[in-house]
């Protein structure tokens, strides 16, 4: 079958397709938007139907352009919309890692900095860059291993290799080896030179004179250096410090250069010696907003705002028509952030406050009149050849300084212009044309050719020299780059490629690695060549002092929890403990809480009372009532600790007052009287003629009531007084002090009364005797 011949009429390529011949056949090359033999069908893949990074392919389905999707791993379906169960589906990568499918069942995690492991689950041991001095860190189990460069060794490549300890020695021909951090240095004998003293020393070959110094041999192994200005030393290695007696003003810092010095000025000053005030208005063109005028001041600037604006930088809008009075019948139109005065004829200025000087046509014909918006005066813009306030004066071009006529042509002034009378051999309006020796372009490298009478002169571009400007000046000849910088000769300039740690046009500045304040938490930064060191404040560690030392590890708190601080810790003690480390058990027994002789035992944040028999309660404060069973038959029960005491009623005795005293036992009845025992007494049955209680007395002495506080008993020729409680004496007239026997127990206070006593008991005790 014959392929389409798109060059034939009726078979041309549609929709911008191009007909191209290849291998003897013609075919339509379609643009991206159309497909098919004649580019007749819209490209079905243009709408990106395949989702989830599936690839769309154009297929022919019975002559109609269709598409088919090749799905990315993990997806299926005609549009790649169906997610297959795969290893990345549940995002197994931890700590912000990104999951990449390798196969349906295998994945690889791209871990963020600081994490490693198949699923980013391990903190990366190399994240803190532990290997110093360019050592390569390799994670190993839960730690790391450092592969050190040849000049360093040790677990973190911080130990310098002593190259001078090698056998045989590195420095040859009797040279002395000096070990340095990361390298070594050979100090050679006068007869040899080279990094390892391997070459015989020939004075001035190569020249040891640095910084462009010229070498002159003065003997077999001696030389002399003639230094360029600004350098000194045996080999011109010292840049003379030009800073003593410098003229840097206003706090400028002197920076030594080669045979000169520069002043590093504070922000508000500039100029060679920091004497010129920095013009902030020039530095910040938008310092004053909304058309405000910037006025520089020493160490600052002021804004003069246009009407309608206010504020330090003229950013605040004012309702201008409220405060602005337009002059002389002008109409005020309020605008956003401004106002506009519509002036009547003959007036001008922002407020129509000026007379318009242009009304009177003060400028000469052909010039342009503008009104000065500040003072209303006319400003005439003159055409070429005229000058003066009204552009009415002719400019004498012949007396403006340089003769406008070249090659000594004579200048003749005319009204508004000038003419040149040329010397023989020259022509042109300004005598600029002569016989042109520059036609052959003799000047190279973009030089300017000056045609002269019978000759030419080449004015070279900067960086070139020679009659035809054919020689490129070597600006590197003077070795201007410091600190081993590499000099690249350019056209009319040079460029220094500085070693790491140095910068500046001449590599003259040591880069201050401390400028970015890498040291954290108040650490001091020590700058060095191409490095810095952080001296940490107390309580911090790490390369940048970023790690707060955990003073809680190991835990210093015995009986409590530890709270870490900066260079300190605080122990929050468990109840019952005290001390800086919670090491002291508080003795809760020190307040003697156990009463009635109870024994105290200290516990954690508590105590325990072991009570004596007869007492109870947490503090043994309760005395058990031994009188509860009423043990005293005929008497009052006094409760004691683990016991009681019976105070017997008169006439009774025994520990329980259950024995009636036999008052007849002593035969108290005289003169043959019969004794009858009673309670707390007896009765005598007297024989006739005797009558007193003991049958002694015929006369009753009790009739006169001699017993003041008691009962009278008549006796033979006398009487006896039985006193009321609390009284004593022959006649019961003496008030007894019942407190003398200390009847109040358990610390109770005794108060003597007329008849008896009263006990005031301590807290927790009661009863007549506080028992």
């Amino acid at each position: 079958a014959r392929g389409p011949r798109c060059s034939q009429p009726g078979e041309t390529c549609l929709n911008g397709g191009k007909c191209e011949a290849a291998n003897g056949t013609e075919a339509c090359v379609c643009g991206g938007a159309f497909v098919g033999p004649r580019c007749q069908d819209p490209n079905p893949c243009l709408s990106t139907p395949c989702k989830n990074a599936g690839t769309c392919h154009v297929v022919d389905r019975r002559g109609v352009a269709d598409y088919a999707c090749s799905c990315a791993l993990g997806f299926s379906g005609p549009l790649c919309l169906t997610p297959l169960d795969n290893a990345c589906l549940t995002n197994p990568c931890r700590n912000g890692g990104t999951c990449d499918l390798l196969t349906l069942t295998e994945y690889k995690c791209r871990c963020p900095p600081g994490w490693s492991g198949k699923s980013c689950q391990q903190a990366d041991p190399c994240a803190s860059n532990p290997c110093a001095n360019g050592g390569q860190c390799l994670p190993f189990e839960a730690s790391y291993i450092c592969h050190c460069p040849p000049s360093f060794h040790g677990p973190t490549c911080r130990q310098d290799v002593n190259e001078c300890g090698q056998k045989p020695g590195l420095c040859r021909h009797g040279g002395t080896c000096h070990n340095e951090v990361g390298s070594y240095r050979c100090v050679c004998r006068a007869t040899h030179t080279g990094p390892n003293c391997e070459r015989p020393y020939v004075p001035c070959s190569p020249s040891p004179c640095q910084n462009g110094g010229t070498c002159r041999p003065t003997g077999d192994v001696t030389h002399e250096c003639a230094c360029l200005p600004g350098f000194t030393g045996q080999n011109c290695e010292e840049n003379i410090d030009d800073c003593p007696g410098n003229n840097c003003k206003n706090g400028g810092a002197c920076v030594d250069g080669v045979n000169t010095y520069n002043c590093r000025c504070p922000p508000e000053w500039t100029g060679q010696y920091c004497t010129e005030d920095v013009d902030e208005c020039q530095l910040m063109p938008n310092a004053c907003q909304n058309g405000g005028t910037c006025h520089n001041t020493h160490g600052g600037y002021n804004c003069v705002c246009v009407n309608g604006w206010t504020g330090e930088d003229c950013s605040e809008n004012i309702d201008d028509c409220a405060s602005a009075a337009c002059f002389h019948g002008a109409t005020c139109h309020d605008r956003v952030a401004s106002f506009y005065c519509e002036c009547p004829h003959g007036r001008t200025g922002l407020l129509c406050h000026l007379n318009d000087a242009c009304i009177s046509n003060p400028c000469n014909e052909g010039s342009n009149c503008d009104t000065n918006p500040v003072n209303g005066k006319a400003i005439c813009t003159c055409p070429s050849g005229y000058t003066g306030p009204a552009c009415s004066q002719d400019v004498d071009e012949c007396s403006l300084g340089a003769n406008p006529c070249e090659h000594a042509g004579k200048c003749i002034n005319t009204l508004g212009s000038f003419e040149c009378q040329c010397l023989q051999g020259y022509t042109g309006p300004r005598c600029e044309i002569d016989v042109n020796e520059c036609v052959s372009n003799p000047c190279q490298n973009d030089a300017t050719c000056l045609d002269q009478i019978g000759e030419f002169q080449c004015i070279c571009m900067p960086g070139y020299e020679g009659v035809h400007c054919e020689v490129n000046t070597d600006e590197c000849a003077s070795s201007p780059c410091l600190h081993n910088g590499r000099c690249l000769d350019k056209i009319n300039e040079f460029q220094c490629e500085c070693p790491t740690g140095f910068t500046g046009h001449l590599c003259q500045y040591d880069v201050d690695e401390c400028a970015s304040t890498p040291c954290k938490n108040g650490a001091k930064c020590l700058d060095g060549p191409n490095t810095y060191t952080c001296v940490c404040t107390e309580g911090y560690t790490g390369t940048h002092c970023e790690v707060d030392i955990d003073e809680c590890d190991p835990d210093p708190c015995h009986y409590g929890s530890c709270k870490d601080g900066v260079a300190t810790f605080t122990c929050l003690c468990r109840p019952g403990y005290t001390g800086h480390h919670c090491e002291t058990n508080i003795n809760e027994c020190s307040s003697q809480p156990c009463r009635h002789g109870g024994t105290c035992q200290d516990r954690d944040n508590a105590y325990l009372c072991f009570c004596l028999k007869g007492t109870t309660g947490p503090n043994c404060e309760i005395n058990l009532d031994d009188c509860a069973s009423s043990p005293c038959d005929s008497g009052t029960c006094l409760d004691k600790i683990d016991g009681y005491e019976c105070a017997c009623e008169p006439g009774y005795t025994g520990s329980m007052c259950n024995i009636n005293i036999d008052e007849c036992a002593g035969n108290p009845c005289h003169n043959g009287g019969t004794c009858e025992d009673g309670i707390n007494g007896f009765t005598c049955r007297c024989p006739e003629g005797y009558h007193d209680p003991t049958c002694l007395s015929e006369v009753n002495e009790c009739n006169s009531n001699p017993c003041v506080h008691g009962a009278c008993r008549d006796s033979l020729n006398g009487y006896k007084c039985d006193c009321d409680p609390g009284w004593s004496g022959t006649n019961c007239d003496i008030n007894n002090n019942e407190c003398e026997s200390n009847p109040c127990v358990n610390g109770g206070t005794c108060k003597d009364m007329t008849s008896g006593y009263v006990c005031t008991c301590r807290e927790g005790f009661s009863g007549p005797n506080c028992q």
Epitope: D85, N86, A87, T90, P92, E106, Y107, K118, Q121
Partner: nanobody
Framework: EVQLVESGGDLVQPGGSLRLSCAAS????????MGWSRQAPGKERELVAS???????LYADAAKGRFAIYRDNSKNTVYLEMNSLKPDDTAVYYC???????????WGQGTQVTVSS
């Protein structure tokens, strides 16, 4: 190879409940995200639910509100509690293990769940 023991698959009526369980060895279980996938006849295998080592869960839209996944770390077992079952839930249910230390996905042998009246 990872050893997984699945159980709990059965024939159940629509609206009924089932609990599937999957036991793994202690070393695999403690370092793996566990879960369940299913494959209905003539369809691709799809994720049903998953639970991370620290207990965060993920459910397919079809499982939300009806199914619950939880893991018993003491028994090294993951469970799928299935409620309000529908005929559409009929499939072979596979225990799935993503081994975080090896970076690999493993499936069990599968247990048949049939929802039919």
């Amino acid at each position: 190879e990872v050893q997984l023991v699945e159980s709990g698959g059965d024939l159940v009526q629509p609206g009924g409940s089932l609990r599937l369980s999957c036991a793994a060895s202690a070393t695999v279980f403690s370092n793996s995200d566990m879960g369940w996938s299913r494959q209905a006849p003539g369809k691709e295998r799809e994720l049903v639910a998953s639970i991370t080592t620290d207990g965060n869960t993920l459910y397919a839209d079809a499982a939300k509100g009806r199914f619950a996944i939880y893991r018993d770390n003491s028994k090294n077992t993951v469970y799928l509690e299935m409620n309000s079952l529908k005929p559409d839930d009929t499939a072979v249910y596979y225990c799935r293990v993503v081994d975080l230390l090896r970076g690999k996905l493993y499936w069990g042998q599968g247990t048949q769940v049939t929802v039919s009246s």
